[in-house]
């Protein structure tokens, strides 16, 4: 069995590796502005921009919980959001170029790359320090779903530089005295 969504207590679900995180709304979670890889969001069918259209990345900041423990610092993660659509010319069957139309293939905004973050947990009752590792979305991308494939099969929308490793998942742990940094972040 692979890693599955991890319900660590009644208040939140931590996504498993190989899954696409959709964090639930929480009181201690704030949503920042939508990002688009440093570029202003643009309409998918804007013919003036022929660069690859990138879906929106919503930044969420929240404290993670694990049982009675809470992360010492809030964690910022991305949620992939918004409608995907091409902003570039693609060849059609007879060699000409055309725009994909809204009634064409379905585009999905999904995680592209992930980062692992080590989070220090603060626990009640003077318990030993603990750490937990979570897998967070680092960037989003559009993938194309054609009518010839069911919804679980997503096609790449344009070239990609990194592909998330499949069948993987994350979770947490106690903290060693030698580890001074409160957290680790690595894009992969």
């Amino acid at each position: 069995q692979g890693w599955q969504a991890f319900r660590n207590d009644a208040t939140e679900v931590i996504p498993g590796l190989g899954e696409y995180p959709e964090p639930p709304p929480e009181n201690n979670q704030t949503m920042n502005r939508a990002e688009n890889g440093g570029r202003p969001p643009h309409h998918p069918y804007d013919a003036k921009d022929v660069s690859e259209y990138s879906c929106r990345e919503l930044h969420y900041t929240r404290f993670l919980t694990d049982g009675p423990c809470r992360s010492a610092k809030p964690v910022t993660e991305l949620v992939c959001s918004g409608q995907c659509g091409p902003a570039r010319l693609l060849p059609n069957a007879i060699g000409r170029v055309k725009w994909w139309r809204p009634n064409g293939p379905d585009f999905r905004c999904i995680p592209d790359r992930y980062r692992a973050q080590r989070v220090q947990l603060l626990c009640p009752g003077g318990a030993a320090p603990r750490s937990r590792k979570v897998r967070l979305v680092a960037s989003c991308k559009c993938k194309r779903l054609t009518r010839f494939h069911n919804q679980s099969e997503l096609k790449d929308f344009g070239p990609e530089t990194a592909r998330p490793q499949k069948g993987r998942k994350p979770r947490p742990g106690a903290r060693g005295a030698k580890a001074n940094q409160a957290e680790l972040e690595n894009a992969y």
Epitope: G2, W3, F6, N8, D9, L17, D66, G67, P68, A116, R118, C123, P124, G125, A127, A128, R130, S131, R132, K133, V134, R135, Q165, G167, R168, K169, P170, R171, P172, G173, A174, R175, G176, K178, A179, Q181, L184, N186, Y188
Partner: antibody
Framework: QVQLVQSGAEVKKPGASVKVSCKVS????????QHWVRQAPGKGLEWMGW????????EYASKFQGRVTMTEDTSTDTAYMELSSLRSEDTAVYYC???????????WGQGTTVTVSS | DIQMTQSPSSLSASVGDRVTITCKAS??????VAWYQQKPGKAPKLLIY???TRWTGVPSRFSGSGSGTDFTLTISSLQPEDFATYYC?????????FGGGTKVEIK
């Protein structure tokens, strides 16, 4: 599918060292903590320590301090546990386990039997 | 180190029985307790953590309760595949320690 596959059984003489490997598949080893737990014949479980492959951080049970070394090769997603100055009471099945925390053991290897005998 | 004392050390039960295993900590461990199941010749499997949270894929007949020093693992209706040895583990204080185990046998 998460799998931890350990190296085969070992027979060692007192005073020698043993190095057990644990190949992890199903996720990158650096995204989790690696744990080692042992079980002497007919006995209960004994936690030996954990390591964080991402930064080489380790925490060992006081009983094994100075005798145990836990390392990983992140390029092959393999964890290693080396125990030195073996004595007969180290005869046990050694398990690797992995988890996203330093305190619980989510997935386990099949175990490696280490026999220490003169 | 915190000592975890399990009782009974073994018990005999029939399929369908309700089984209760207890674990007592030598000092307050809050709810930092996990339970594992181990079958002969096999590695342990995580059942419960934080005293009462079921691990992924664990059947609902397994439940955990308790806080402080007294903890309980309950199997509401024993199934043939549940005959095994069960261990509690505390992770409140370094270094993590296990109970001595409770062997559940067929009556």
């Amino acid at each position: 599918q998460v799998q931890l596959v350990q190296s085969g059984a070992e027979v060692k003489k007192p005073g020698a060292s043993v190095k057990v490997s644990c190949k992890v598949s199903g996720f990158p080893i650096k995204h989790h903590f690696q744990h080692w737990v042992r079980q002497a014949p007919g006995k209960g479980l004994e936690w030996m320590g954990w390591s964080d492959p991402e930064i080489g951080d380790t925490e060992y049970a006081s009983k094994f301090q100075g005798r145990v070394t836990m390392t990983e090769d992140t390029s092959t997603d393999t964890a290693y546990m080396e125990l030195s100055s073996l004595r007969s009471e180290d005869t046990a099945v050694y398990y690797c386990a992995t988890g996203d925390t330093t305190y619980k053991f989510d997935f386990w290897g099949q175990g490696t039997t280490v026999t220490v005998s003169s | 180190d915190i000592q975890m004392t399990q009782s009974p050390s073994s018990l005999s039960a029939s399929v369908g029985d309700r089984v209760t295993i207890t674990c007592k900590a030598s000092q307050d461990v809050h709810t930092a307790v996990a339970w594992y199941q181990q079958k002969p010749g096999k590695a342990p499997k995580l059942l419960i953590y934080w005293a009462s949270t079921r691990w992924t894929g664990v059947p609902s007949r397994f439940s955990g309760s308790g806080s402080g020093t007294d903890f309980t693992l309950t199997i509401s209706s024993l199934q043939p595949e549940d005959f095994a040895t069960y261990y509690c583990q505390q992770y409140s204080d370094y270094h993590w320690t296990f109970g001595g185990g409770t062997k559940v046998e067929i009556k």
